[in-house]
Amino acid sequence: MNSFNYTTPDYGHYDDKDTLDLNTPVDKTSNTLRVPDILALVIFAVVFLVGVLGNALVVWVTAFEAKRTINAIWFLNLAVADFLSCLALPILFTSIVQHHHWPFGGAACSILPSLILLNMYASILLLATISADRFLLVFKPIWCQNFRGAGLAWIACAVAWGLALLLTIPSFLYRVVREEYFPPKVLCGVDYSHDKRRERAVAIVRLVLGFLWPLLTLTICYTFILLRTWSRRATRSTKTLKVVVAVVASFFIFWLPYQVTGIMMSFLEPSSPTFLLLNKLDSLCVSFAYINCCINPIIYVVAGQGFQGRLRKSLPSLLRNVLTEESVVRESKSFTRSTVDTMAQKTQAV
Protein backbone atom coordinates (compact mmCIF):
# COMPACT_ATOMS: atom_id res chain seq x y z
CA MET A 1 0.00 0.00 0.00
CA ASN A 2 1.13 3.49 0.55
CA SER A 3 4.47 3.96 -1.17
CA PHE A 4 6.96 6.24 -2.68
CA ASN A 5 7.90 6.47 -6.25
CA TYR A 6 10.19 8.77 -8.07
CA THR A 7 8.14 9.43 -11.13
CA THR A 8 10.90 11.20 -12.86
CA PRO A 9 14.42 11.36 -11.74
CA ASP A 10 13.59 13.60 -8.90
CA TYR A 11 10.21 14.64 -7.84
CA GLY A 12 8.56 13.75 -4.58
CA HIS A 13 5.53 11.93 -5.72
CA TYR A 14 3.54 9.85 -3.29
CA ASP A 15 1.87 6.94 -4.87
CA ASP A 16 0.48 4.56 -2.29
CA LYS A 17 1.84 1.48 -3.91
CA ASP A 18 5.30 0.04 -3.55
CA THR A 19 7.84 2.48 -4.87
CA LEU A 20 9.25 5.95 -4.12
CA ASP A 21 8.88 8.67 -6.75
CA LEU A 22 9.67 12.26 -7.65
CA ASN A 23 8.30 14.35 -10.60
CA THR A 24 4.69 14.92 -10.17
CA PRO A 25 3.42 17.07 -7.35
CA VAL A 26 3.71 15.25 -4.10
CA ASP A 27 0.03 15.58 -3.64
CA LYS A 28 -2.93 17.28 -5.08
CA THR A 29 -2.96 20.82 -3.84
CA SER A 30 -6.69 21.19 -3.78
CA ASN A 31 -8.60 21.15 -0.51
CA THR A 32 -10.99 18.65 -2.05
CA LEU A 33 -10.18 14.97 -2.27
CA ARG A 34 -10.16 13.12 -5.58
CA VAL A 35 -13.19 10.96 -6.38
CA PRO A 36 -11.29 7.63 -5.97
CA ASP A 37 -10.14 8.75 -2.52
CA ILE A 38 -13.69 9.70 -1.52
CA LEU A 39 -14.95 6.29 -2.65
CA ALA A 40 -12.11 4.65 -0.71
CA LEU A 41 -13.13 6.54 2.43
CA VAL A 42 -16.75 5.41 2.08
CA ILE A 43 -15.62 1.78 1.64
CA PHE A 44 -13.23 2.04 4.60
CA ALA A 45 -16.00 3.38 6.82
CA VAL A 46 -18.42 0.60 5.88
CA VAL A 47 -15.74 -2.10 6.14
CA PHE A 48 -14.70 -0.83 9.55
CA LEU A 49 -18.23 -0.86 10.96
CA VAL A 50 -19.26 -4.21 9.47
CA GLY A 51 -15.82 -5.79 9.88
CA VAL A 52 -15.28 -4.91 13.52
CA LEU A 53 -18.80 -5.80 14.65
CA GLY A 54 -19.21 -8.81 12.37
CA ASN A 55 -15.83 -10.37 13.08
CA ALA A 56 -16.08 -9.63 16.81
CA LEU A 57 -19.37 -11.51 16.79
CA VAL A 58 -17.82 -14.41 14.85
CA VAL A 59 -14.87 -14.53 17.28
CA TRP A 60 -17.28 -14.52 20.23
CA VAL A 61 -19.42 -17.29 18.74
CA THR A 62 -16.52 -19.52 17.67
CA ALA A 63 -14.17 -18.97 20.62
CA PHE A 64 -16.32 -21.09 22.96
CA GLU A 65 -16.47 -23.95 20.45
CA ALA A 66 -12.87 -23.83 19.24
CA LYS A 67 -11.62 -26.32 21.84
CA ARG A 68 -13.63 -29.11 20.35
CA THR A 69 -15.05 -28.07 16.98
CA ILE A 70 -12.63 -27.97 14.07
CA ASN A 71 -14.82 -25.78 11.86
CA ALA A 72 -14.98 -23.24 14.70
CA ILE A 73 -11.16 -23.17 14.76
CA TRP A 74 -11.04 -22.29 11.06
CA PHE A 75 -13.65 -19.55 11.32
CA LEU A 76 -12.13 -18.17 14.52
CA ASN A 77 -8.73 -17.74 12.86
CA LEU A 78 -10.22 -16.17 9.74
CA ALA A 79 -12.22 -13.73 11.86
CA VAL A 80 -9.15 -12.80 13.91
CA ALA A 81 -7.21 -12.05 10.69
CA ASP A 82 -10.02 -9.86 9.42
CA PHE A 83 -10.59 -8.17 12.78
CA LEU A 84 -6.89 -7.26 13.12
CA SER A 85 -6.87 -5.67 9.68
CA CYS A 86 -9.97 -3.64 10.48
CA LEU A 87 -8.22 -2.07 13.47
CA ALA A 88 -5.85 -0.24 11.12
CA LEU A 89 -8.70 1.38 9.19
CA PRO A 90 -9.26 4.52 11.31
CA ILE A 91 -5.57 5.43 10.85
CA LEU A 92 -5.62 4.77 7.10
CA PHE A 93 -8.88 6.71 6.84
CA THR A 94 -7.37 9.70 8.66
CA SER A 95 -4.31 9.65 6.41
CA ILE A 96 -6.41 9.78 3.22
CA VAL A 97 -8.55 12.59 4.64
CA GLN A 98 -5.30 14.52 5.21
CA HIS A 99 -4.21 13.98 1.60
CA HIS A 100 -1.98 11.05 2.60
CA HIS A 101 -0.17 12.98 5.34
CA TRP A 102 1.10 10.48 7.93
CA PRO A 103 1.41 12.03 11.42
CA PHE A 104 1.52 8.67 13.21
CA GLY A 105 5.25 7.94 13.18
CA GLY A 106 7.59 5.36 11.70
CA ALA A 107 6.51 2.32 13.73
CA ALA A 108 2.86 2.82 12.81
CA CYS A 109 3.88 3.27 9.17
CA SER A 110 5.66 -0.08 9.18
CA ILE A 111 2.98 -2.00 11.05
CA LEU A 112 -0.49 -0.68 10.19
CA PRO A 113 -0.46 -0.67 6.37
CA SER A 114 1.22 -4.11 6.49
CA LEU A 115 -1.80 -5.55 8.32
CA ILE A 116 -3.84 -5.83 5.11
CA LEU A 117 -1.04 -7.87 3.53
CA LEU A 118 -0.78 -10.02 6.65
CA ASN A 119 -4.53 -10.50 6.32
CA MET A 120 -4.16 -11.43 2.66
CA TYR A 121 -1.53 -14.08 3.32
CA ALA A 122 -3.10 -15.35 6.54
CA SER A 123 -6.50 -15.61 4.92
CA ILE A 124 -5.30 -17.36 1.77
CA LEU A 125 -3.17 -19.79 3.78
CA LEU A 126 -6.04 -20.48 6.17
CA LEU A 127 -8.31 -20.87 3.17
CA ALA A 128 -5.87 -23.37 1.71
CA THR A 129 -5.81 -25.22 5.05
CA ILE A 130 -9.61 -25.31 5.20
CA SER A 131 -9.74 -26.46 1.60
CA ALA A 132 -7.30 -29.26 2.37
CA ASP A 133 -9.53 -30.20 5.30
CA ARG A 134 -12.60 -30.23 3.04
CA PHE A 135 -10.72 -32.27 0.45
CA LEU A 136 -9.60 -34.86 2.99
CA LEU A 137 -13.11 -35.14 4.43
CA VAL A 138 -14.42 -35.99 0.99
CA PHE A 139 -11.62 -38.15 -0.34
CA LYS A 140 -9.92 -39.59 2.80
CA PRO A 141 -12.73 -40.01 5.34
CA ILE A 142 -11.06 -42.92 7.12
CA TRP A 143 -7.86 -40.90 7.64
CA CYS A 144 -10.00 -38.07 8.98
CA GLN A 145 -11.74 -40.39 11.42
CA ASN A 146 -8.35 -41.40 12.81
CA PHE A 147 -6.31 -38.20 12.72
CA ARG A 148 -8.53 -35.14 12.19
CA GLY A 149 -8.54 -33.39 15.56
CA ALA A 150 -8.53 -29.95 17.16
CA GLY A 151 -4.82 -30.19 18.00
CA LEU A 152 -3.85 -30.74 14.39
CA ALA A 153 -6.16 -27.92 13.29
CA TRP A 154 -4.48 -25.49 15.70
CA ILE A 155 -1.03 -26.58 14.48
CA ALA A 156 -2.15 -26.00 10.88
CA CYS A 157 -3.41 -22.52 11.81
CA ALA A 158 -0.16 -21.71 13.60
CA VAL A 159 1.82 -22.72 10.50
CA ALA A 160 -0.46 -20.57 8.32
CA TRP A 161 0.03 -17.55 10.61
CA GLY A 162 3.79 -18.09 10.73
CA LEU A 163 4.07 -18.26 6.94
CA ALA A 164 1.83 -15.20 6.60
CA LEU A 165 4.11 -13.20 8.91
CA LEU A 166 7.13 -14.37 6.94
CA LEU A 167 5.58 -13.31 3.63
CA THR A 168 4.64 -9.88 5.04
CA ILE A 169 8.22 -9.12 6.14
CA PRO A 170 9.43 -7.58 2.81
CA SER A 171 6.71 -4.92 2.81
CA PHE A 172 7.27 -4.31 6.50
CA LEU A 173 11.03 -3.85 6.06
CA TYR A 174 10.82 -1.50 3.08
CA ARG A 175 8.15 0.68 4.63
CA VAL A 176 9.40 4.09 5.74
CA VAL A 177 8.18 7.58 6.54
CA ARG A 178 9.46 10.37 4.37
CA GLU A 179 9.23 14.06 5.01
CA GLU A 180 7.96 16.08 2.07
CA TYR A 181 8.26 19.84 1.71
CA PHE A 182 6.13 21.03 -1.20
CA PRO A 183 3.62 20.88 0.41
CA PRO A 184 4.96 20.14 3.90
CA LYS A 185 3.84 16.72 5.09
CA VAL A 186 5.06 13.31 6.15
CA LEU A 187 4.41 10.40 3.81
CA CYS A 188 4.30 6.72 4.63
CA GLY A 189 5.35 4.37 1.88
CA VAL A 190 7.59 1.65 0.61
CA ASP A 191 11.04 2.72 -0.50
CA TYR A 192 12.97 0.38 -2.78
CA SER A 193 15.67 3.03 -3.32
CA HIS A 194 15.20 3.08 -7.08
CA ASP A 195 15.76 -0.69 -7.28
CA LYS A 196 13.11 -1.55 -9.86
CA ARG A 197 14.10 -5.24 -9.91
CA ARG A 198 13.50 -5.60 -6.19
CA GLU A 199 10.18 -3.80 -6.51
CA ARG A 200 9.11 -6.11 -9.34
CA ALA A 201 10.25 -9.18 -7.39
CA VAL A 202 8.08 -8.21 -4.40
CA ALA A 203 5.10 -7.52 -6.68
CA ILE A 204 5.53 -10.84 -8.53
CA VAL A 205 5.92 -12.86 -5.32
CA ARG A 206 2.80 -11.17 -3.94
CA LEU A 207 0.85 -11.89 -7.12
CA VAL A 208 1.97 -15.53 -7.38
CA LEU A 209 1.84 -16.57 -3.70
CA GLY A 210 -1.08 -14.38 -2.68
CA PHE A 211 -3.24 -14.77 -5.75
CA LEU A 212 -2.38 -16.91 -8.81
CA TRP A 213 -1.15 -20.07 -7.08
CA PRO A 214 -4.03 -20.12 -4.57
CA LEU A 215 -6.47 -19.39 -7.38
CA LEU A 216 -5.19 -22.36 -9.37
CA THR A 217 -4.99 -24.82 -6.47
CA LEU A 218 -8.32 -23.85 -4.92
CA THR A 219 -10.08 -23.99 -8.28
CA ILE A 220 -8.78 -27.54 -8.78
CA CYS A 221 -9.54 -28.49 -5.18
CA TYR A 222 -13.12 -27.25 -5.28
CA THR A 223 -13.73 -28.67 -8.73
CA PHE A 224 -12.96 -32.12 -7.28
CA ILE A 225 -14.94 -31.51 -4.10
CA LEU A 226 -17.99 -30.20 -5.92
CA LEU A 227 -17.89 -32.93 -8.55
CA ARG A 228 -17.81 -35.56 -5.81
CA THR A 229 -20.53 -33.99 -3.66
CA TRP A 230 -22.63 -33.18 -6.74
CA SER A 231 -22.52 -36.79 -7.87
CA ARG A 232 -24.03 -37.97 -4.59
CA ARG A 233 -27.77 -37.50 -4.42
CA ALA A 234 -27.85 -37.00 -0.65
CA THR A 235 -25.53 -34.04 -0.81
CA ARG A 236 -26.60 -32.38 -4.01
CA SER A 237 -27.25 -28.79 -3.03
CA THR A 238 -27.20 -25.60 -5.06
CA LYS A 239 -26.88 -23.77 -1.77
CA THR A 240 -23.63 -25.57 -1.08
CA LEU A 241 -22.31 -24.74 -4.51
CA LYS A 242 -23.35 -21.10 -4.20
CA VAL A 243 -21.82 -20.59 -0.76
CA VAL A 244 -18.54 -22.32 -1.57
CA VAL A 245 -18.22 -20.33 -4.79
CA ALA A 246 -19.13 -17.08 -2.99
CA VAL A 247 -16.62 -17.69 -0.25
CA VAL A 248 -13.68 -18.58 -2.48
CA ALA A 249 -14.60 -16.06 -5.17
CA SER A 250 -14.82 -13.16 -2.71
CA PHE A 251 -11.12 -13.36 -1.97
CA PHE A 252 -10.09 -13.31 -5.60
CA ILE A 253 -12.63 -10.72 -6.71
CA PHE A 254 -11.70 -8.19 -4.04
CA TRP A 255 -7.94 -8.68 -4.32
CA LEU A 256 -7.89 -8.59 -8.13
CA PRO A 257 -7.70 -4.78 -8.64
CA TYR A 258 -4.92 -4.40 -6.05
CA GLN A 259 -2.88 -7.23 -7.54
CA VAL A 260 -3.33 -6.07 -11.15
CA THR A 261 -2.47 -2.43 -10.43
CA GLY A 262 0.44 -3.48 -8.23
CA ILE A 263 2.05 -5.64 -10.88
CA MET A 264 1.40 -3.06 -13.61
CA MET A 265 2.94 -0.23 -11.59
CA SER A 266 6.05 -2.26 -10.88
CA PHE A 267 6.64 -2.65 -14.62
CA LEU A 268 5.61 0.83 -15.75
CA GLU A 269 7.78 3.91 -15.89
CA PRO A 270 6.64 6.18 -13.07
CA SER A 271 6.32 9.12 -15.46
CA SER A 272 3.97 7.25 -17.80
CA PRO A 273 0.30 8.34 -18.02
CA THR A 274 -0.88 4.81 -17.15
CA PHE A 275 1.24 4.76 -14.00
CA LEU A 276 -0.11 8.13 -12.93
CA LEU A 277 -3.70 6.99 -13.56
CA LEU A 278 -3.19 3.76 -11.60
CA ASN A 279 -1.52 5.73 -8.86
CA LYS A 280 -4.64 7.86 -8.46
CA LEU A 281 -6.71 4.68 -8.11
CA ASP A 282 -4.48 3.08 -5.52
CA SER A 283 -6.42 4.00 -2.38
CA LEU A 284 -9.55 2.70 -4.05
CA CYS A 285 -7.85 -0.61 -4.89
CA VAL A 286 -6.65 -0.97 -1.29
CA SER A 287 -10.12 -0.22 0.03
CA PHE A 288 -11.60 -2.76 -2.38
CA ALA A 289 -9.17 -5.39 -1.05
CA TYR A 290 -10.25 -4.41 2.46
CA ILE A 291 -13.80 -5.53 1.68
CA ASN A 292 -12.46 -9.03 2.31
CA CYS A 293 -12.22 -8.10 5.97
CA CYS A 294 -15.95 -7.67 6.35
CA ILE A 295 -17.39 -9.96 3.69
CA ASN A 296 -17.08 -13.21 5.65
CA PRO A 297 -19.59 -12.40 8.41
CA ILE A 298 -22.00 -11.23 5.70
CA ILE A 299 -21.61 -14.53 3.83
CA TYR A 300 -22.13 -16.47 7.06
CA VAL A 301 -25.33 -14.59 7.85
CA VAL A 302 -26.68 -14.90 4.30
CA ALA A 303 -25.80 -18.62 4.32
CA GLY A 304 -27.36 -19.04 7.74
CA GLN A 305 -30.58 -17.38 6.64
CA GLY A 306 -30.66 -19.60 3.60
CA PHE A 307 -30.26 -22.75 5.64
CA GLN A 308 -32.73 -21.66 8.32
CA GLY A 309 -35.40 -20.63 5.84
CA ARG A 310 -35.82 -17.10 7.24
CA LEU A 311 -34.05 -15.17 9.94
CA ARG A 312 -36.00 -16.46 12.88
CA LYS A 313 -33.09 -16.95 15.25
CA SER A 314 -30.90 -14.39 16.92
CA LEU A 315 -27.73 -13.48 15.07
CA PRO A 316 -25.39 -15.28 17.49
CA SER A 317 -27.37 -18.50 17.39
CA LEU A 318 -27.65 -18.29 13.62
CA LEU A 319 -23.90 -17.86 13.36
CA ARG A 320 -23.35 -20.65 15.87
CA ASN A 321 -25.34 -22.98 13.63
CA VAL A 322 -23.35 -22.00 10.57
CA LEU A 323 -19.88 -21.87 12.11
CA THR A 324 -19.70 -24.55 14.75
CA GLU A 325 -21.46 -27.54 13.21
CA GLU A 326 -18.92 -30.32 13.03
CA SER A 327 -18.30 -32.27 9.88
CA VAL A 328 -19.07 -35.92 10.60
CA VAL A 329 -17.44 -38.62 8.52
CA ARG A 330 -20.07 -41.23 7.75
CA GLU A 331 -19.35 -44.85 7.01
CA SER A 332 -21.00 -44.29 3.65
CA LYS A 333 -18.09 -41.95 2.96
CA SER A 334 -20.49 -39.20 2.07
CA PHE A 335 -21.50 -36.07 3.92
CA THR A 336 -24.72 -35.39 5.64
CA ARG A 337 -26.53 -32.29 4.40
CA SER A 338 -25.39 -30.38 7.49
CA THR A 339 -21.78 -31.31 6.87
CA VAL A 340 -21.88 -30.09 3.30
CA ASP A 341 -23.72 -26.95 4.36
CA THR A 342 -21.09 -26.26 6.98
CA MET A 343 -18.35 -26.77 4.44
CA ALA A 344 -20.15 -24.36 2.23
CA GLN A 345 -20.23 -21.72 4.84
CA LYS A 346 -16.82 -20.51 4.34
CA THR A 347 -13.78 -21.89 2.97
CA GLN A 348 -12.53 -18.53 3.63
CA ALA A 349 -11.72 -15.98 1.11
CA VAL A 350 -8.67 -14.11 2.03
Epitope: Y11, N23, P25, V26, T29, E179, Y181, F182, P183, P184
Partner: antibody, heavy 116, light 107 residues
Framework: DVQLQESGPGLVKPSQSLSLTCTVT?????????WNWIRQFPGNKLEWMGY???????SYNPSLKSRISITRDTSKNQFFLQFYSVTTEDTARYYC?????????WGQGTTLTVSS | DIQMTQSPSSLSASLGEKVSLTCRAS??????LSWLQQKPDGSIKRLIY???TLDSGVPKRFSGSRSGSVYSLTISSLESEDFADYYC?????????FGGGTKLEIR
Protein backbone atom coordinates in the same frame (compact mmCIF):
# COMPACT_ATOMS: atom_id res chain seq x y z
CA ASP B 1 19.13 30.39 16.21
CA VAL B 2 19.45 28.92 12.71
CA GLN B 3 21.91 30.77 10.52
CA LEU B 4 22.93 30.09 6.93
CA GLN B 5 25.92 31.58 5.14
CA GLU B 6 26.71 31.23 1.44
CA SER B 7 30.17 31.43 -0.07
CA GLY B 8 31.43 31.10 -3.63
CA PRO B 9 33.97 32.21 -6.23
CA GLY B 10 32.18 35.44 -7.15
CA LEU B 11 33.40 35.59 -10.75
CA VAL B 12 33.71 32.72 -13.22
CA LYS B 13 34.14 32.33 -16.97
CA PRO B 14 31.46 30.81 -19.23
CA SER B 15 31.60 26.99 -19.62
CA GLN B 16 33.47 26.60 -16.33
CA SER B 17 32.20 24.56 -13.39
CA LEU B 18 31.85 25.93 -9.90
CA SER B 19 30.77 25.09 -6.40
CA LEU B 20 28.85 27.21 -3.90
CA THR B 21 28.87 26.37 -0.20
CA CYS B 22 26.22 26.96 2.43
CA THR B 23 27.41 26.68 6.03
CA VAL B 24 24.67 26.13 8.59
CA THR B 25 25.13 27.06 12.24
CA UNK B 26 22.77 26.62 15.17
CA UNK B 27 21.08 23.61 13.61
CA UNK B 28 22.11 20.20 12.29
CA UNK B 29 21.34 19.60 8.61
CA UNK B 30 20.65 15.96 9.49
CA UNK B 31 17.98 16.77 12.12
CA UNK B 32 15.10 17.52 9.78
CA UNK B 33 14.02 19.90 7.02
CA UNK B 34 15.27 20.35 3.46
CA TRP B 35 18.22 22.53 2.59
CA ASN B 36 17.60 24.51 -0.58
CA TRP B 37 19.33 26.62 -3.18
CA ILE B 38 17.42 29.55 -4.67
CA ARG B 39 18.75 32.20 -7.04
CA GLN B 40 17.71 35.74 -7.89
CA PHE B 41 18.44 37.08 -11.34
CA PRO B 42 19.43 40.69 -12.01
CA GLY B 43 15.80 41.54 -12.84
CA ASN B 44 14.86 40.30 -9.32
CA LYS B 45 13.13 37.11 -10.51
CA LEU B 46 13.55 34.31 -7.95
CA GLU B 47 13.98 30.65 -8.94
CA TRP B 48 14.05 27.55 -6.75
CA MET B 49 16.92 25.29 -7.83
CA GLY B 50 16.69 22.22 -5.61
CA TYR B 51 17.26 20.77 -2.18
CA UNK B 52 18.97 18.08 -0.20
CA UNK B 53 16.85 16.80 2.67
CA UNK B 54 18.04 15.90 6.16
CA UNK B 55 18.01 12.25 5.07
CA UNK B 56 20.08 12.97 1.97
CA UNK B 57 17.23 12.80 -0.54
CA UNK B 58 17.75 15.24 -3.40
CA SER B 59 15.26 17.04 -5.59
CA TYR B 60 15.98 19.45 -8.42
CA ASN B 61 14.02 21.91 -10.50
CA PRO B 62 13.50 20.06 -13.82
CA SER B 63 14.69 23.10 -15.76
CA LEU B 64 18.13 22.80 -14.12
CA LYS B 65 18.46 19.11 -13.44
CA SER B 66 21.11 18.26 -16.02
CA ARG B 67 23.37 21.16 -15.02
CA ILE B 68 23.50 21.09 -11.24
CA SER B 69 24.05 18.76 -8.35
CA ILE B 70 23.51 19.25 -4.64
CA THR B 71 25.66 17.45 -2.10
CA ARG B 72 26.53 17.82 1.58
CA ASP B 73 29.22 17.31 4.17
CA THR B 74 27.48 16.40 7.40
CA SER B 75 30.67 16.56 9.44
CA LYS B 76 31.03 20.25 8.59
CA ASN B 77 27.26 20.91 8.55
CA GLN B 78 27.54 22.24 5.00
CA PHE B 79 25.73 21.63 1.76
CA PHE B 80 26.88 22.51 -1.74
CA LEU B 81 25.63 23.49 -5.15
CA GLN B 82 27.75 22.27 -8.04
CA PHE B 83 27.19 24.00 -11.36
CA TYR B 84 28.41 22.48 -14.62
CA SER B 85 29.20 24.56 -17.68
CA VAL B 86 27.88 27.94 -16.59
CA THR B 87 26.68 30.60 -19.02
CA THR B 88 26.19 34.33 -18.64
CA GLU B 89 22.52 33.52 -17.95
CA ASP B 90 23.59 32.06 -14.62
CA THR B 91 24.70 35.45 -13.33
CA ALA B 92 22.60 35.89 -10.19
CA ARG B 93 22.58 36.17 -6.43
CA TYR B 94 22.50 32.68 -4.91
CA TYR B 95 20.72 32.01 -1.62
CA CYS B 96 20.56 28.96 0.57
CA UNK B 97 17.42 28.47 2.64
CA UNK B 98 15.84 25.96 4.96
CA UNK B 99 12.45 24.49 4.07
CA UNK B 100 10.15 23.10 6.70
CA UNK B 101 6.88 24.94 6.15
CA UNK B 102 7.94 26.99 3.18
CA UNK B 103 11.36 28.66 3.35
CA UNK B 104 11.72 29.84 6.91
CA UNK B 105 15.42 30.73 7.17
CA TRP B 106 17.55 32.35 4.48
CA GLY B 107 21.21 33.14 4.05
CA GLN B 108 22.47 36.60 3.03
CA GLY B 109 23.20 35.42 -0.49
CA THR B 110 26.37 35.33 -2.58
CA THR B 111 26.69 37.02 -5.95
CA LEU B 112 27.92 35.01 -8.91
CA THR B 113 28.97 36.80 -12.06
CA VAL B 114 29.60 34.80 -15.21
CA SER B 115 31.68 36.82 -17.63
CA SER B 116 34.49 36.25 -20.10
CA ASP C 1 4.51 24.97 -12.97
CA ILE C 2 2.15 27.19 -11.01
CA GLN C 3 2.42 30.86 -11.97
CA MET C 4 2.25 33.44 -9.22
CA THR C 5 1.13 36.83 -10.50
CA GLN C 6 1.97 39.59 -8.04
CA SER C 7 0.58 43.10 -8.15
CA PRO C 8 1.36 45.92 -8.13
CA SER C 9 4.98 45.63 -9.31
CA SER C 10 5.77 48.86 -7.48
CA LEU C 11 3.95 50.98 -4.96
CA SER C 12 4.61 54.39 -3.41
CA ALA C 13 3.13 55.06 0.00
CA SER C 14 3.55 57.32 3.00
CA LEU C 15 4.46 56.50 6.58
CA GLY C 16 1.40 55.43 8.58
CA GLU C 17 -0.51 54.49 5.45
CA LYS C 18 -2.27 51.13 4.99
CA VAL C 19 -1.18 49.13 1.93
CA SER C 20 -2.16 45.81 0.38
CA LEU C 21 -0.18 43.63 -2.02
CA THR C 22 -1.84 40.78 -3.89
CA CYS C 23 -0.75 37.52 -5.42
CA ARG C 24 -2.84 35.35 -7.73
CA ALA C 25 -2.11 31.64 -8.22
CA SER C 26 -2.71 30.07 -11.64
CA UNK C 27 -3.83 26.83 -9.93
CA UNK C 28 -5.20 25.84 -6.54
CA UNK C 29 -2.49 26.10 -3.88
CA UNK C 30 -4.68 25.49 -0.82
CA UNK C 31 -3.12 28.20 1.33
CA UNK C 32 0.45 26.96 0.87
CA LEU C 33 1.74 30.50 0.46
CA SER C 34 4.43 32.62 2.11
CA TRP C 35 5.22 36.31 1.97
CA LEU C 36 8.89 37.29 1.98
CA GLN C 37 10.52 40.65 2.61
CA GLN C 38 13.82 41.56 0.91
CA LYS C 39 15.74 44.49 2.28
CA PRO C 40 17.99 46.68 0.07
CA ASP C 41 21.08 44.80 1.32
CA GLY C 42 19.64 41.61 -0.23
CA SER C 43 18.71 39.87 3.01
CA ILE C 44 15.44 37.91 2.86
CA LYS C 45 13.07 37.31 5.77
CA ARG C 46 9.83 35.35 5.88
CA LEU C 47 6.88 37.34 7.23
CA ILE C 48 3.94 35.01 6.74
CA TYR C 49 3.40 31.33 5.98
CA UNK C 50 0.30 29.21 5.37
CA UNK C 51 -1.28 32.34 3.82
CA UNK C 52 -2.07 34.04 7.12
CA THR C 53 0.21 32.80 9.90
CA LEU C 54 2.62 35.44 11.15
CA ASP C 55 6.23 34.38 11.75
CA SER C 56 7.55 34.89 15.25
CA GLY C 57 9.11 38.30 15.70
CA VAL C 58 7.15 39.85 12.83
CA PRO C 59 5.21 42.99 13.84
CA LYS C 60 1.42 42.65 14.15
CA ARG C 61 0.89 45.35 11.52
CA PHE C 62 1.57 42.66 8.90
CA SER C 63 -1.28 40.32 8.08
CA GLY C 64 -2.07 37.80 5.37
CA SER C 65 -5.40 36.75 3.94
CA ARG C 66 -6.92 34.70 1.16
CA SER C 67 -9.91 35.02 -1.10
CA GLY C 68 -10.13 32.07 -3.47
CA SER C 69 -6.95 32.01 -5.52
CA VAL C 70 -6.03 35.60 -4.58
CA TYR C 71 -3.73 36.06 -1.58
CA SER C 72 -3.05 39.42 0.08
CA LEU C 73 -0.42 40.91 2.34
CA THR C 74 -1.61 43.95 4.25
CA ILE C 75 0.54 46.38 6.24
CA SER C 76 -1.85 48.32 8.47
CA SER C 77 0.42 51.29 9.20
CA LEU C 78 3.68 51.67 7.29
CA GLU C 79 6.89 52.27 9.19
CA SER C 80 10.24 53.29 7.73
CA GLU C 81 11.74 49.78 7.94
CA ASP C 82 8.85 48.37 5.86
CA PHE C 83 10.05 49.98 2.64
CA ALA C 84 11.52 47.01 0.84
CA ASP C 85 10.73 44.41 -1.85
CA TYR C 86 8.01 41.85 -1.13
CA TYR C 87 7.59 38.44 -2.75
CA CYS C 88 4.93 35.80 -2.54
CA UNK C 89 5.92 32.15 -2.80
CA UNK C 90 3.80 29.04 -3.17
CA UNK C 91 5.02 25.72 -1.81
CA UNK C 92 1.99 23.65 -2.78
CA UNK C 93 3.87 21.37 -5.16
CA UNK C 94 7.03 20.95 -7.20
CA UNK C 95 8.62 23.26 -8.13
CA UNK C 96 7.79 26.03 -5.64
CA UNK C 97 7.55 29.33 -7.53
CA PHE C 98 7.76 33.00 -6.62
CA GLY C 99 5.78 36.06 -7.56
CA GLY C 100 7.51 38.78 -9.58
CA GLY C 101 7.81 41.01 -6.52
CA THR C 102 6.44 44.36 -5.36
CA LYS C 103 8.78 47.27 -4.70
CA LEU C 104 7.38 49.35 -1.84
CA GLU C 105 8.84 52.87 -1.86
CA ILE C 106 8.40 55.97 0.28
CA ARG C 107 6.28 58.61 -1.38
Amino acid sequence: DVQLQESGPGLVKPSQSLSLTCTVTGYSITSDSAWNWIRQFPGNKLEWMGYISYSGRISYNPSLKSRISITRDTSKNQFFLQFYSVTTEDTARYYCARASIGFDYWGQGTTLTVSS
Amino acid sequence: DIQMTQSPSSLSASLGEKVSLTCRASQEISGYLSWLQQKPDGSIKRLIYAASTLDSGVPKRFSGSRSGSVYSLTISSLESEDFADYYCLHYANYPPTFGGGTKLEIR
